[in-house]
């Protein structure tokens, strides 16, 4: 790969601290190995939806299915774990749904709920119709998958009604759940039919049953739960971004970069430049030249707006991003036209991360 | 599973430069920066810089700039850390850790001496 | 520079007690801190990156939050395996700075 050299004396070190960013969380869905996975695009009104993983296009192949709205990944590897993104773009602007997908040994997804309404779970009976346990919202029990980050807060419910009134106990793996089991122990709560782990760890994988009984019968239902747990991630960039741009000379243009990073991630834009007619330094390496970088001085650094553009504009632009723990770059080609030449939105072009696994 | 092994301890001469090796398995050595960081006698840590071997992009701790070199060798995973000009006060344990600081290596002792 | 300010710089305490480390930033360096800790004769370990992530293998009983410039490492029942001395660092911006280190003792 190769390196650069700078001119104008710019430095690709940040020289004051970078400007803050919000960083978004995105949903985590989990399969097993072997298993397959259908996710929906959570976007409305898309013309066009595009897909990549860790920043990179996802198209068609043997095992990825790209239907609609759809993405079906069949006989899941834990290869396929990652960052996704679909993508839907629209005839004025583009809208992004990030979701994290982890293929393990351990399957699930999910979030926990408030337990503000548990209290119509609770069902009284006549006391002249004796029934067997059932369940009295299944809605609440649909999701058995449940994929939550270590030190989260785990809930799973299984309201249900019965007469008598059944009693409710949890087996993990298929034996007795008991409190000295999990290190802080668990809550149950019979009003809301609920268990309750807080701060969970990674010994607590694996299923939890719920077995509620009366003397006219017993139902059960499993969920299973993964704990997923969090490793430093170097920055990953949308895929297609910066796309590439055409505009006449005196024209106005705008380059987009969007960035996904836990850790405070620095934002440079950089263009391939001559010195003394030349593209190269004597030691072979392309001139480069900091154009914008994101620090107290620098609005939205995400994106580089080129005013008034000459020919000189024209060229690649690359959109670098680094964190303590990496760096990622995309770039994309502004083409600059005669003032009689009509501007058109190019075609865009994915341009090929530098980063690839 | 991520590895980082050090080279082995060394003792030089006040005025002399030393040059410290760090091997990395177990992951893809382009992906993550390679920091170098060192700890004196009793005292705490202090980072002197990085190394992101994708594209030989570094940045030091000013306080070192000018006197250490980070470099790597992508075709043995290799990183190099070099200080020069060495001091009494350079008496330290040199480590090297990726990226993400998550992982470490053993640390190399430099002892500067006359 | 951003300054690392720890405190305490020693602390005793006895297996099973709860205790807290604190880390202040000389500036605004929302949850960009990791935790180390670090035995005789050792290289630190990665205990909490990003204020609050509890690294992979990190049992539970360590905890980081924080946020801007103020932020804490909680152990909830010290064993003994956790007598070491504990560093913070910001990640936010180059030079990244560690804290002086605090050093928990058996009481």
């Known amino acids: 790969r190769p390196s650069f050299s700078l001119v104008e004396d710019t430095t690709l070190e940040p020289e004051e601290p970078p400007t803050k960013y919000q960083i978004s969380q995105p949903e985590v869905y989990v399969a097993a190995p072997g298993e397959s996975l259908e996710v929906r695009c959570l976007l409305k009104d898309a013309a066009v939806i595009s897909w990549t993983k860790d920043g990179v296009h996802l198209g068609p192949n043997n095992r990825t299915v790209l239907i609609g709205e759809y993405l079906q990944i069949k006989g899941a590897t834990p290869r396929d774990s990652g960052l996704y993104a679909c993508t839907a773009s629209r005839t004025v602007d583009s809208e992004t749904w990030y979701f994290m997908v982890n293929v393990t040994d351990a399957i699930s997804s999910g979030d926990d709920e408030d337990d503000t309404d548990g209290a119509e779970d609770f069902v009284s009976e006549n006391s002249n119709n004796k029934r067997a346990p059932y369940w009295t919202n299944t809605e609440k029990m649909e999701k058995r998958l449940h994929a939550v980050p270590a030190a989260n807060t785990v809930k799973f419910r299984c309201p249900a009604g019965g007469n008598p009134m059944p009693t409710m106990r949890w087996l993990k793996n298929g034996k007795e759940f008991k409190q000295e089991h999990r290190i802080g122990g668990y809550k149950v709560r019979n009003q809301h039919w609920s268990l309750i782990m807080e701060s969970v760890v990674p010994s607590d994988k694996g299923n939890y049953t719920c077995v509620v009984e009366n003397e006219y019968g017993s139902i059960n239902h499993t969920y299973h739960l993964d704990v997923v747990e969090r490793s430093p991630h170097r920055p990953i960039l949308q895929a297609g971004l910066p796309a590439n741009a055409s505009t006449v000379v005196g024209g106005d243009v705008e380059f987009v970069c969007k960035v996904y990073s836990d850790a405070q991630p620095h934002i440079q834009w950089i263009k391939h430049v001559e010195k003394n007619g030349s593209k190269y330094g004597p030691d072979g390496l392309p001139y480069l030249k900091v154009l914008k970088h994101s620090g107290i001085n620098s609005s939205n650094a995400e994106v580089l707006a080129l005013f008034n553009v000459t020919e000189a504009d024209a060229g690649e632009y690359i959109c670098k991003v680094s964190n303590y723990i990496g760096q990622a770059n995309q770039s994309a080609w502004l083409t600059v036209l005669p003032k009689q030449q009509a501007p058109g939105r190019e075609k865009e072009i994915t341009a090929s991360p530098d980063y690839l696994e | 599973q991520a590895q980082l092994v050090q080279s082995g301890a060394e003792v030089k001469k006040p005025g002399a430069s030393v040059k410290v090796s760090c091997k990395a398995s177990?992951?893809?050595?382009?992906?993550?920066?390679l920091h170098w960081v060192r700890q004196a006698p009793g005292q705490g840590l202090e980072w002197m810089g990085l190394i992101y071997p994708g594209n030989d992009d570094t940045s030091y701790n000013q306080k070192f700039r000018g006197r250490a070199t980070l470099t790597v060798d992508r075709s043995t995973s290799t990183a190099y850390m070099e200080l020069s000009s060495l001091r009494s006060e350079d008496t330290a344990v040199y480590y090297c850790a990726r990226g993400g600081f998550d992982y470490w290596g053993q640390g190399t002792l430099v002892t500067v001496s006359s | 520079d951003i300054q690392m300010t720890q405190s305490p710089s020693s602390l005793s305490a006895s297996v099973g007690d709860r205790v807290t480390i604190t880390c202040k930033a000389s500036q605004d360096v929302t949850t960009n801190v990791a935790w180390y800790q670090q035995k005789p004769g050792k290289s630190p370990k990665l205990l909490i990156f990003s204020a609050s992530y509890r690294f992979t293998g990190v049992p539970s009983r360590f905890s980081g939050s924080g946020s801007g410039t103020d932020f804490t490492l909680t152990i909830s029942s010290l064993q003994p395996e956790d007598f070491a001395t504990y560093y913070c660092q910001q990640h936010y911006g180059t030079p990244y700075t560690f804290g002086q280190g605090t050093k928990l003792e058996i009481k």
């Open positions: 177990g992951y893809t050595f382009t992906n993550y920066n």
